[in-house]
């Protein structure tokens, strides 16, 4: 099939006092092989500080996955989610509040 770029969505949720979990979700992409990873101040976080979901079919012939990490509240601006898929790449900031979701479709 032809390449379908992902929709990337970054959300945040309270984890524990002073900490939040930031989650970067990619959906609707094809083929399955995608890079999704968190950076702090432009430097990649180690694997052991990130949690990944499996790449799963979403029922539409495309795929979805996610990566999450726990960070200190107030440091959100230092973190970005990085995505590579089929020769394209993009970075996605953490939204400033719980109600803000960032959706980006990349071509």
């Amino acid at each position: 099939g032809s390449t379908v770029p992902p929709m990337v969505n970054v959300t945040r949720s309270e984890a524990s006092e002073g900490n939040i979990t930031v989650t970067c979700r990619a959906s609707g992409f094809y083929p399955w092989n995608i890079t999704l990873s968190w950076r702090q101040d432009g430097v990649s976080l180690s694997h052991d500080t990130q949690q990944w979901g499996d790449v799963l079919p979403d029922g539409n012939g495309t795929y979805q996955t996610w990566v999450a990490t726990r960070i200190c509240q107030g440091e959100e601006q230092r973190f970005t989610c990085y995505m590579e898929h089929s020769g394209n790449h993009s970075t996605h900031p953490v939204p400033s509040g719980n109600s803000h979701h960032h959706h980006h479709h990349h071509h």
Partner: antibody, heavy 120, light 107 residues
Amino acid sequence: QVQLKESGPGLVAPSQSLSITCTVSGFALTGSGVNWVRQPPGKGLEWLGMIWGDGNTDYNSALKSRLSISKDNSKSQIFLKMNSLQTDDTARYYCARGAHYGKRWYFDVWGAGTTVTVSS
Amino acid sequence: DIQMTQTTSSLSASLGDRVTISCSASQGINNYLNWYQQKPDGTVKLLIYYTSSLPSGVPSRFSGSGSGTDYSLTISNLEPEDIATYYCQQYSKLPPTFGGGTKVEIK
């Protein structure tokens, strides 16, 4: 098919800088990370650093002050520059494509390597 | 940095033998472990990724296992083309680090 090929000076004088080029084919540098790994004679492998598809870099902190990795997407080339070379930088230098899929991160295709000798 | 130790630096085995190469990490690495094969001419090839996954094109006589800090690579039926040095590599924490290698020779 995916290929990587390193080219370097062969011999570098102590205190001088090293420049190595990795030329790739079969994949786009905009969507893949490329790593540099070296191997001193008779020893094991050491990861130096990498450059991501967007040009962002990660370095081995032990060498970060002497290392610079850059690339030219249009020429399909990645460049390693290392300053202030000493004799213990004598090694075979490899570039390798990184595959980073969730929990999996591995170097799936390697170049043949280029030998660099630091000597006066 | 995480230290990777391959206690056996070299071993001799007969063709057809089952060969097991061990690797231990200085701390738990959560299965974030790869194996590479380096031929005498210096050519390096990915053999096993994420502890036990086999890339396409790698013969099924190679297998990997382990958890926590202890991992192993097994060659079930040694063939002449398996003469090489084998390296484990962790990617749990940056920088990725390699073991010192285990050289496999024919008896």
